[in-house]
């Protein structure tokens, strides 16, 4: 014969456990129903009556099957440097992540507690390590033969153009300026277009451009903000 189905509340077998989506109520000493996500226990079970569940009140939630007397409060509205990537609903908490150009300086279990603006490398310095959802940009001085003339959280140091005749030599924050001689030029993508260079950049190693990262949803543990690197500008 098939085993008889027990309806909650029921007393478990000695040493037995309650079934999935049930809990053992110590007071009633019975297996009772849990409440589904989005609800909470309004009235706890007794020996003769099962748990009474009710919907979560505005701005509160439960994510799991539960028997809590009150739903959990959703987190505060996202701040101006954040975007809401998950709204507060009866079943889930609000999740705030950093908007593009910012990174998470202080994480929480889901989303970000504190966003900080990505460091911008000033002219003469380029991005050595791009920012991620949880780490700041690292700047480095442009090495001889390379330059950066921007204040940017994404631009790397780029090689100077090669001139037959140099009008103005390049430095860490400015490209070389060539005299107008031959119209021939072959330049790497993204280089500054100044008058008439003639040869290629083949004798320079072109650094691989770092991806421009827009912080998205990341639930990693926080990487603490690094100290201001040489050449960074606080914006």
């Amino acid at each position: 014969l098939p085993a008889q189905v027990a309806f909650t509340p029921y007393a478990p077998e000695p040493g037995g456990t309650c079934r999935l989506r049930e809990y053992y109520d110590q007071t009633a000493q019975m297996c009772c129903s849990k409440c589904p996500p989005g609800q909470h226990a309004k009235v706890f079970c007794t020996k003769t009556s099962d748990t009474v569940c009710d919907s979560c009140e505005d701005s509160t939630y439960t994510q799991l099957w539960n028997w809590v007397p009150e739903c959990l409060s959703c987190g505060s509205r996202c701040s101006s440097d954040q975007v809401e990537t998950q709204a507060c609903t009866r079943e889930q908490n609000r999740i705030c992540t950093c908007r593009p150009g910012w990174y998470c300086a202080l994480s929480k279990q889901e989303g970000c507690r504190l966003c900080a603006q990505l460091r911008k490398c000033r002219p003469g310095f380029g991005v050595a390590r791009p920012g991620t959802e949880t780490s700041d940009v690292v700047c480095k001085p442009c090495a001889p033969g390379t330059f950066s003339n921007t204040t940017s959280s994404t631009d790397i140091c780029r090689p100077h153009q090669i001139c037959h005749v140099v009008a103005i030599p390049g430095n860490a924050s400015m490209d070389a300026v060539c005299t107008s001689t031959s119209p021939t030029r072959s330049m790497a993508p993204g280089a500054v277009h100044l008058p008439q260079p003639v040869s290629t950049r083949s004798q320079h190693t072109q650094p691989t451009p770092a991806p421009s990262t827009a912080p998205g949803t990341s639930f990693l543990l926080p990487v603490g903000p690094s100290p201001p690197a040489e050449g960074s500008t606080g914006d």
Epitope: S55, D58, S59, S73, S76, A87, C88, R94
Partner: antibody, heavy 120, light 108 residues
Framework: QVQLVQSGSELKKPGASVKVSCKAS????????MHWVRQAPGQGLEWMGR????????KHDPKFQDKAVLSSDTSVSTAYLQISSLKAEDTAVYYC?????????????WGQGTLVTVSS | DIQMTQSPSSLSASVGDRVTITCTAS???????LHWYQQKPGKAPKLLIY???NLPSGVPSRFSGSGSGTDYSLTISSLQPEDFATYYC?????????FGQGTKVEIK
């Protein structure tokens, strides 16, 4: 854009009932509450109750529990407030206002108000 | 019920003045659940500040809010002609949700 448009003014006799409507447009009725707030002439704002249009669940100020019936029809995106046993002191402007779930009850959009006058 | 008491009930001020309105709750209210509304004669109320200190888009930055527990305030840093109106605080912490009695800001 978000709009709440209420029905027109009403003149009623004491003891009668009135039903005020509030038609919502420009947003999804899911995950919002619709509140009713009244304002007697020259007086402040008084919260009467609210309805969750998705479920029909209502909550009232106990003061209005037997006086006001809140309902909604999601097929026409409209919330209703019915007030029974009208008295002269029920003369007021009645506003509907919405609050999105998760916004801690901040009523971000309001109807234009419906004046209900109770006079014999 | 949580009673919300605003002070002053009315005030006269000039354009450019700094104005502060206070709201005292009869029991503690979570700052997330405290809001302010502005109402002009013959018009519906308008959400001015939500969750104690946050401005909805379109609300000028001269408006600010602060507070916690039972004591909250709304400040207008430099009163403009369009700010003459009645202001209400509102708690959504515990049902029934209640409004303050209002503070009328008039032209001096």
């Amino acid at each position: 854009q978000v709009q709440l448009v209420q029905s027109g003014s009403e003149l009623k006799k004491p003891g009668a009932s009135v039903k005020v409507s509030c038609k919502a447009s420009g947003f999804n009725n899911k995950d919002i509450y619709m509140h009713w707030v009244r304002q007697a002439p020259g007086q402040g704002l008084e919260w009467m109750g609210r309805i969750d249009p998705a479920t029909g669940n209502t909550k009232h100020d106990p003061k209005f529990q037997d006086k006001a019936v809140l309902s909604s029809d999601t097929s026409v995106s409209t919330a209703y407030l019915q007030i029974s046993s009208l008295k002269a002191e029920d003369t007021a402007v009645y506003y509907c206002a919405r609050s999105p779930y998760g916004d801690f009850g901040a009523m971000d959009y309001w109807g234009q108000g419906t004046l209900v006058t109770v006079s014999s | 019920d949580i009673q919300m008491t605003q002070s002053p009930s009315s005030l006269s001020a000039s354009v450019g003045d700094r104005v502060t309105i206070t709201c005292t709750a009869s029991s503690s209210v979570s700052s997330n659940y405290l809001h302010w509304y502005q109402q002009k004669p013959g018009k519906a109320p308008k959400l001015l500040i939500y969750s104690t200190s946050n401005l909805p888009s379109g609300v000028p930055s001269r408006f600010s809010g602060s507070g916690s527990g039972t004591d909250y305030s709304l400040t207008i840093s430099s009163l403009q002609p369009e700010d003459f109106a009645t202001y209400y605080c509102h708690q959504y912490h515990r049902s029934p949700w209640t409004f303050g009695q209002g503070t009328k800001v008039e032209i001096k």
